[in-house]
């Protein structure tokens, strides 16, 4: 009778992460008597995947009933495959021995490759807000994909950006990879409603590329412009002075009126009006009793916006 051969018919198998891998193995004879074991890798450091005789292997099931006396099919299924399962798997026949079974013959091996989807890209912007005309950096990260080939694009409001740097790690062979990209974006006053999008395309994606977004409303600070004007006299000895605070973002704003350098009133922006571009306008007014002043009055509208140093605008009120 011909000597037993261990046949692994598949040189290579490709499986999607999360799916089940079937590793086929048959023996050409029932003799010698002894169990089959599956290993990943060869040599002394090989990893035991399945032992017919003993042990607990929750992810492994056999294709055939190995308890049947005439069974020669030793194929296995490994469930919930991850990129970490990639490698070469060997089906090894042992001969019954005492005290230990002795390795008799190995199959040629089946290389298991795993394809894994990239995680949803996460876009993060700068920690502090920045003002228009400044350049800010956004980062995009996606992890866990295989194979290594991946494309990443940046967009601002649908327009592709070109000023970015991308790295895929690790540089060498690995079971899975990560991508990290940094894009530079120049802010404009109209960017409150703008979005920065990071788009990742990979062979495993059946839909459109995966997208991560960041709203520039979380990044931009548009400082206000101030205008102080004197309204016609409302009543005898009373003058109405208004401070127009225009085109600011975010809303957080505190206004202080000063009369000749002395604090007259402080208020917080509440009933603001929103512009089409997402910025806000607000108006504060001060009623000045002219008869209380002998000399001309210097009225100052001082605005502290979003925790920044105060900006101010003054108006000289003539007392005739």
């Amino acid at each position: 009778e011909e000597e037993l051969q261990v046949i692994q018919p598949d040189k290579s198998v490709l499986v999607a992460a999360g799916e089940t891998a079937t590793l086929r193995c048959t023996a050409t004879s029932l003799i010698p008597v002894g169990p089959i074991q599956w290993f990943r890798g060869a040599g002394p450091g090989r990893e035991l995947i399945y032992n017919q005789k003993e042990g607990h292997f929750p992810r492994v099931t056999t294709v055939s009933d190995l308890t049947k006396r005439n069974n020669m099919d030793f194929s296995i299924r490994i469930g919930n495959i991850t990129p970490a399962d990639a490698g070469t798997y060997y089906c090894v026949k042992f001969r019954k021995g005492s005290p230990d079974d002795v390795e008799f013959k190995s199959g040629a091996g089946t290389e298991l490759s795993v394809r894994a989807k990239p995680s949803a890209p996460v876009v993060s912007g700068p920690a502090a807000r920045a003002t228009p005309q400044h350049t800010v950096s956004f980062t995009c990260e996606s992890h866990g994909f295989s194979p290594r080939d991946i494309t990443l694009k940046w967009f601002k409001n649908g327009n592709e950006l070109s000023d970015f740097q991308t790295n895929v790690d690790p540089v060498g062979e690995s079971v899975s990879y990560s991508i990290h990209s940094t894009a530079k974006v120049v802010l404009t006053r109209e960017d409150v409603h703008s979005q920065v999008i990071c788009e990742v395309a990979h062979v495993t994606l059946q839909g459109d590329p995966l997208r991560g977004t960041a709203n520039l409303s979380e990044t931009i600070r548009v400082p206000p412009t101030l205008e102080v004007t004197q309204q016609p006299v409302r009543a005898e000895n009373q003058v109405n002075v208004t401070c127009q605070v225009r085109k600011f973002y975010p809303q957080r704003l505190q206004l202080t009126w000063l009369e000749n350098g002395n604090v007259s009133r402080t208020e917080t922006a509440s009933t603001v009006t929103e512009n089409k571009d997402g910025t806000y306008n607000w108006m504060s007014w001060l009623l000045v009793n002219v008869s209380a002043h002998r000399d001309d009055v210097k009225l100052t509208c001082q605005v502290e916006h979003d925790g920044q140093p105060a900006v101010s605008k003054s108006h000289d009120l003539k007392v005739s």
């Epitope: 194979p147 494309t151 059946q206 839909g207």
Partner: antibody, heavy 116, light 109 residues
Framework: VQLVESGGRLVQPGTPLTLSCTVS????????MGWFRQAPGKGLEYIGI?????SPYYASWVNGRFTISKTSTTMDLKMNSPTTEDTATYFC?????????????WGPGTLVTVSS | DIQMTQSPSSLSASVGDRVTITCRAS??????LAWYQQKPGKAPKLLIY???FLYSGVPSRFSGSGSGTDFTLTISSLQPEDFATYYC???????????FGQGTKVEIK
């Protein structure tokens, strides 16, 4: 799992024609689908794909000559203004479950003849 | 666009022969290459995907190898049902576009 193309016929140059690919055994919302063609005695040529979410992508030579769309069970290829060079058998195909780099299921094809 | 050059364009062989068809890409496509078999009046049938993986139900006499720009389809022992035209097809992960080789017709000697 099956794909069947329909709508192929003799059409005059410039007359729009829509081909359909009817699928069964799987959901169009889970796979990328593609259109290909083969002129008599020639090789296979890629026309375009439609993603699982419904976005079409075209070969660089298409330049608006074709439009790909889909419903829940059919994928369509509209020939916007056919010329005699568009005479071919048109195939629809589905990409493999492991990735969009290969097509594992093909329809039998439908013949379009463009002639005056 | 990537060009795929298949060779030979046709070959004559006998049953039992070992047949090799090559496909060259004009730029690297890594391992994103598939091989199809097509018989007259029929749709293409997938044989090999990702350069070297045998598609389910395809006889083991078919094998694929290569990566980067050079790829090979081998039929270890030609069978009567293997007389057909074979196409390679690439996918480019940057342009996300597909290109076919011009085909290799395998005829009976």
């Amino acid at each position: 799992v099956q794909l069947v193309e329909s709508g192929g016929r003799l059409v005059q140059p410039g007359t729009p024609l829509t081909l359909s690919c009817t699928v069964s055994g799987f959901s169009l919302s889970s796979y990328v689908m593609g259109w290909f063609r083969q002129a008599p005695g020639k090789g296979l040529e890629y026309i375009g794909i439609i993603s699982s979410s419904g976005s079409p992508y075209y070969a660089s030579w298409v330049n608006g000559r074709f439009t790909i769309s889909k419903t829940s069970t059919t994928m369509d290829l509209k020939m916007n203004s056919p010329t005699t060079e568009d005479t071919a058998t048109y195939f629809c195909a589905r990409v493999g479950p492991l990735g969009v780099d290969y097509f594992n299921i093909w329809g039998p094809g439908t013949l379009v003849t463009v002639s005056s | 666009d990537i060009q795929m050059t298949q060779s030979p364009s046709s070959l004559s062989a006998s049953v039992g022969d070992r047949v090799t068809i090559t496909c060259r890409a004009s730029q690297s496509i890594n391992s994103y290459l598939a091989w199809y078999q097509q018989k007259p009046g029929k749709a293409p049938k997938l044989l090999i995907y990702s350069a070297s993986f045998l598609y389910s139900g395809v006889p083991s006499r078919f094998s694929g190898s290569g990566s980067g720009t050079d790829f090979t389809l081998t039929i270890s022992s030609l069978q009567p049902e293997d007389f057909a035209t074979y196409y390679c097809q690439s996918w480019h992960y940057i342009s996300r576009s597909y290109t076919f080789g011009q085909g290799t017709k395998v005829e009976i000697k």
